[in-house]
């Protein structure tokens, strides 16, 4: 039962991570630049994302422009786009693998196969978490590098946007959820082979689990 609880918690965390990752990739708040107007107040804020850039005026009016040319984008931005999409697709694949092996589904009947699928989904979610982390950390590194670069003027320096924090959260949730699904595996995985171990046991108490966990027909 504890194993099922951990599985549910793991998959809930990964789902939250996936949603966070989707929002992070879609929102144009990766890099933020504030421009000071005549009266020493922020006149405009420019948000840059993976797909578009937006300008928010002091009046609150916002206008966004989708990047018209992929070729015009820096290679790191193109890579971030690709990794973001791949990470989301990998996580979706992980979810499908999990659903096939979940305790409450009947896609796969054998318990050891189910356990293997849950373990696989956990690993896939961890990979997705790492893939999410790469573009976020890379972009943050570029912003911080420019911030401390004396050749970059003050007005040209950007700040970390909300999308980066969402990306870190997404990555953390995917890694944590995937890790939990991997951790449920030893208990899930040993349920299959335990049938055979029980056949050769001379006495039930030699196995630490309660006898109620095993089908009685397996006892010699």
């Amino acid at each position: 039962m504890a194993s099922a609880g951990m599985q549910i918690l793991g998959v809930v965390l990964t789902l939250l991570g996936w949603v966070n990752g989707l929002v992070s990739c879609a929102l144009p708040m990766w890099k933020v630049t504030a421009f000071i107007g005549n009266s020493i107040v922020v006149a405009q804020v420019v948000w840059e994302g993976l797909w578009m850039s937006c300008v928010v005026q002091s009046t609150g009016q916002m206008q966004c422009k989708v990047y018209d040319s992929l070729l015009a984008l820096p290679q790191d931005l193109q890579a971030a786009r690709a990794l973001c999409v791949i990470a989301l697709l990998v996580a979706l694949f992980g979810l499908l693998v999990y659903l096939a092996g979940a305790k409450c589904t009947t896609c796969v009947e054998e318990k050891d196969s189910k356990a293997r699928l849950v373990l696989t989904s956990g690993i896939v979610f961890v990979i997705s978490g790492v893939l999410t982390l790469i573009p976020v950390c890379w972009t943050a590194h570029a912003i911080i590098r420019d911030f401390y670069n004396p050749l970059v003027a003050e007005a040209q320096k950007r700040e970390l946007g909300a999308s980066l924090y969402l990306g870190w959260a997404a990555s953390g949730l995917l890694l944590l959820g995937g890790g939990l699904l991997c951790c449920t595996c030893p208990s899930g995985g040993s349920q299959g082979p335990s049938h055979y171990m029980a056949r050769y046991s001379t006495s039930a108490p030699a196995i630490s689990r309660g006898p109620s966990e095993y089908p009685t027909k397996n006892y010699v």
Epitope: L73, P74, A155
Partner: antibody, heavy 124, light 107 residues
Framework: QVQLQQSAPELARPGASVRMSCKAS????????MHWVKQRPGQGLEWIGF????????EYNQNLKDKTTLTADKASSTAYMQLTSLTSEDSAVYYC?????????????????WGQGTSVTVSS | DIVMTQSRKFMSTSVGDRVSITCKAS??????VAWYQQKPGQSPKLLLY???TRHTGVPDRFTGSGSGTDYTLTISSVQAEDLALYYC?????????FGAGTKLELK
């Protein structure tokens, strides 16, 4: 400090080609987009196009696209503009100018540092 | 293409006067307007961008305002060295377009 040093004035015959240079110093050449602007005698400013030195990506003003080729040499931090099939309409001062903003595309096309200009005279 | 219109080709002023140069865009450019100063025989010099943000080293007598399609460059107290050509430019999208210029001259 940021400097854009442009090549010497050019005198060319109609139908000929010229290639002018713009050597950048005082900043990381590949980080900033380089624009080119045309100014005919006693006239206003006309945008020619830009090049992103890191990738070589170019964008041109459609009116001048067939006449102009922009290139950049990362090793020497130099941007080049070639003008072909010259006519008297091409007699002008040509400026290279650095894009102020690091913002990738859209909104950020203000030009903060300009070269001293290269004068091109087309005469037979 | 976005057309930038500077309705006045010339503006006469005296030293110490307050002067405003206007520029109208053919469509909303979301305050993505820059102003340049050009003196005879020199290359243009960036004064303001984002309609109201002063570039490094630009005196605070130069201020900018506007939104949507209408933009203004104001010199609060004209100095002799301010007599020059002033261009507005939209930095909203390519192709970049400039106004025809307004020449500030002494009365």
């Amino acid at each position: 400090q940021v400097q854009l040093q442009q090549s010497a004035p050019e005198l060319a015959r109609p139908g000929a080609s010229v290639r002018m240079s713009c050597k950048a110093s005082g900043y990381t050449f590949t980080t900033y987009t380089m624009h080119w602007v045309k100014q005919r005698p006693g006239q206003g400013l006309e945008w020619i196009g830009f090049i992103i030195p890191s990738s070589g990506y170019t964008e041109y003003n459609q009116n001048l696209k067939d006449k102009t080729t922009l290139t950049a040499d990362k090793a020497s931090s130099t941007a080049y503009m070639q003008l072909t099939s010259l006519t008297s309409e091409d007699s002008a001062v040509y400026y290279c100018a650095r894009q102020f903003s690091l913002i990738t595309t859209g909104f950020g096309y203000a030009l903060d540092y300009w070269g001293q200009g290269t004068s091109v005279t087309v005469s037979s | 293409d976005i057309v930038m219109t500077q309705s006045r080709k010339f503006m006469s002023t005296s030293v110490g006067d307050r002067v405003s140069i206007t520029c109208k865009a053919s469509q909303d450019v979301s305050t993505a307007v820059a102003w340049y100063q050009q003196k005879p025989g020199q290359s243009p010099k960036l004064l303001l961008y984002w309609a109201s943000t002063r570039h490094t080293g630009v005196p605070d007598r130069f201020t900018g305002s506007g939104s949507g399609t209408d933009y203004t460059l104001t010199i609060s107290s004209v100095q002799a060295e301010d007599l020059a050509l002033y261009y507005c430019q939209q930095h909203y999208s390519t192709p970049l377009t400039f106004g025809a210029g307004t020449k500030l001259e002494l009365k």
